[in-house]
Interface confidence: medium
């Protein structure tokens, strides 16, 4: 015959664990139903009884099993600049995230503190290094043989096209100029632009007893330009 | 309007602890920071730490590490902060203080303070 | 830890003169272009007021006598015609990094 399925609460075997979905209780010193995301423990078990759960209030969340005693509070509103790219559920803490071309130059564990606009690249400087949700664009002196005629944070330096006759030679901010028979190579036209960067949740622990993690929520500063640093504009 | 009310003043012997309640009211309490800043008579400003209601997270000055415990109670938007193995330099008038998540990143709101008196 | 050091420690000024206090940081408290420095006022038996935040931004219902400026370590308030309420000490303080900081303070008085 197969064995006897316990139903919580039970005691559990010596030296054995509980099983899946549930949590020993210290107090009752039984294996006790865990809550579902979405929900916390209204009542604990006793010798008796199972965990009652409930569900979370507005503006509140669990994302895991737990037994909480009350829900996690979603993180505050985002600014009215800032992108809201997860909604607070019952399952689910709110996610902000700094609008497109800005990143996150100031954090803390709640979230972004300060969202700054991404450095531009002036002509004759490149992208080094593109902009991430935490780190600003580097950029690069367009080398000999290429050029940048852009102020961009995803534009990175080309090389110029070579000519069978050059009208105008190419300098770090200008492509050459060929006469007008056609050049024996070019680029593909058009500006060459790095990806903007894929946003990616940071995580924070919640407090015990839940043993999970809740992403962490951004915040926007609302600022003014950075200040031109070499080889880039603020504007 | 946003007012933060602290508990009253405190005499406590060395090496005992203190806990200090501010209850905050006139904005959504688990949205922005709580800083605790402490002032000995006639001296300066001391930042002690600071905990963020909606999680429970704190960050604690490193010179009260071991001595200092953040807490809050969401349910009645009150924030505590506990300060154990008092000596006679903690005698000070320690104040909460609200700061923005986003914003000003400033205490823009204070408490009106409570006089914690370590004695023997 | 970032040390504010402000000067000078105290100011004796005329009714209507131009009150200047300055706060130096031991380094940088700019972070992309903001500058995280604000100023307080405090008197007596008082808790502390914000005045200005952020360097330079004046907080709501504050005079407009009062104006900051400054950036990167070098910070200056300015009470631009001295009032006999403006008698107080001003204390200026960083929030770029744990642990947050205060200057020691500068004692503001009528002459």
């Known amino acids: 015959l197969p064995a006897q399925v316990a139903f919580t609460p039970y005691a559990p075997e010596p030296g054995s664990t509980c099983r899946l979905r549930e949590y020993y209780d210290q107090t009752a010193q039984m294996c006790c139903s865990k809550c579902s995301p979405g929900q916390h423990a209204k009542v604990f078990c006793t010798k008796t009884s199972d965990t009652v759960c409930d569900s979370c209030e507005d503006s509140t969340y669990t994302q895991l099993w737990n037994w909480v005693p009350e829900c996690l509070s979603c993180g505050s509103r985002c600014s009215s600049d800032q992108v809201e790219t997860q909604a607070c559920t019952r399952e689910q803490n709110r996610i902000c995230t700094c609008r497109p071309g800005w990143y996150c130059a100031l954090s803390k564990q709640e979230g972004c503190r300060l969202c700054a606009p991404l450095r531009k690249c002036r002509p004759g400087f490149g992208v080094a290094r593109p902009g991430t949700e935490t780190s600003d664009v580097v950029c690069k002196p367009c080398a000999p043989g290429t050029f940048s005629n852009t102020t961009s944070s995803t534009d990175i330096c080309r090389p110029h096209q070579i000519c069978n006759v050059v009208a105008i030679p190419g300098n770090a901010s200008m492509d050459a100029v060929c006469t007008s028979t056609s050049p024996t190579r070019s680029m593909a036209p058009g500006a060459v632009h790095l990806p903007q960067p894929v946003s990616t949740r940071s995580q924070h622990t919640q407090p015990t007893p839940e043993p999970s993690t809740a992403p962490s929520t951004s915040f926007l500063l609302p600022m003014g330009p950075s200040p031109p640093a070499e080889g880039s504009t603020g504007d | 309007q946003v007012q933060l009310v602290q508990s009253g003043a405190e005499v406590k012997k060395p090496g005992a602890s203190v806990k200090v309640s501010c209850k905050a009211s006139?904005?959504?309490?688990?949205?922005?920071?709580i800083d605790w800043v402490r002032q000995a008579t006639g001296q300066g400003l001391e930042w002690m730490g600071e905990?963020?209601?909606?999680?429970?997270?704190?960050y604690y000055n490193e010179k009260f590490k071991g001595r200092v415990t953040m807490t809050r109670n969401k349910s009645i938007s009150t924030a505590y902060m506990e300060l154990s193995s008092l000596r006679s330099e903690d005698t000070a008038v320690y104040y909460c203080?609200?700061?923005?998540?986003?914003?000003?990143?400033?205490?823009?709101?204070w408490g009106q303070g409570t006089l914690v008196t370590v004695s023997s | 830890d970032i040390v504010l050091t402000q000067s000078p420690d105290s100011l004796a000024v005329s009714l209507g003169e131009r009150a200047t206090i300055n706060c130096r940081a031991s380094?940088?408290?700019?972070?992309?272009?903001?500058?995280?420095m604000h100023w307080y006022q405090q008197k007596p038996g008082q808790p502390p007021k914000l005045l200005i935040y952020?360097?330079?931004n004046l907080e709501s219902g504050v005079p407009d006598r009062f104006s900051g400026s400054g950036a990167r370590t070098d910070f200056t308030l300015t009470i631009s015609s001295l009032q006999a309420e403006d008698v107080a000490v001003y204390y200026c303080?960083?929030?770029?990094?744990?642990?947050?900081?205060f200057g020691q303070g500068t004692k503001v008085e009528i002459k």
């Open positions: 380094e940088s408290v700019d972070n992309s272009g903001n500058s995280f």
């Open positions: 303080q960083q929030s770029k990094e744990d642990p947050y900081t």
């Open positions: 952020r360097a330079s």
């Open positions: 006139g904005y959504t309490f688990t949205d922005d920071y």
């Open positions: 905990i963020y209601p909606g999680s429970g997270n704190t």
């Open positions: 203080a609200r700061s923005q998540v986003y914003g000003k990143i400033a205490m823009d709101h």
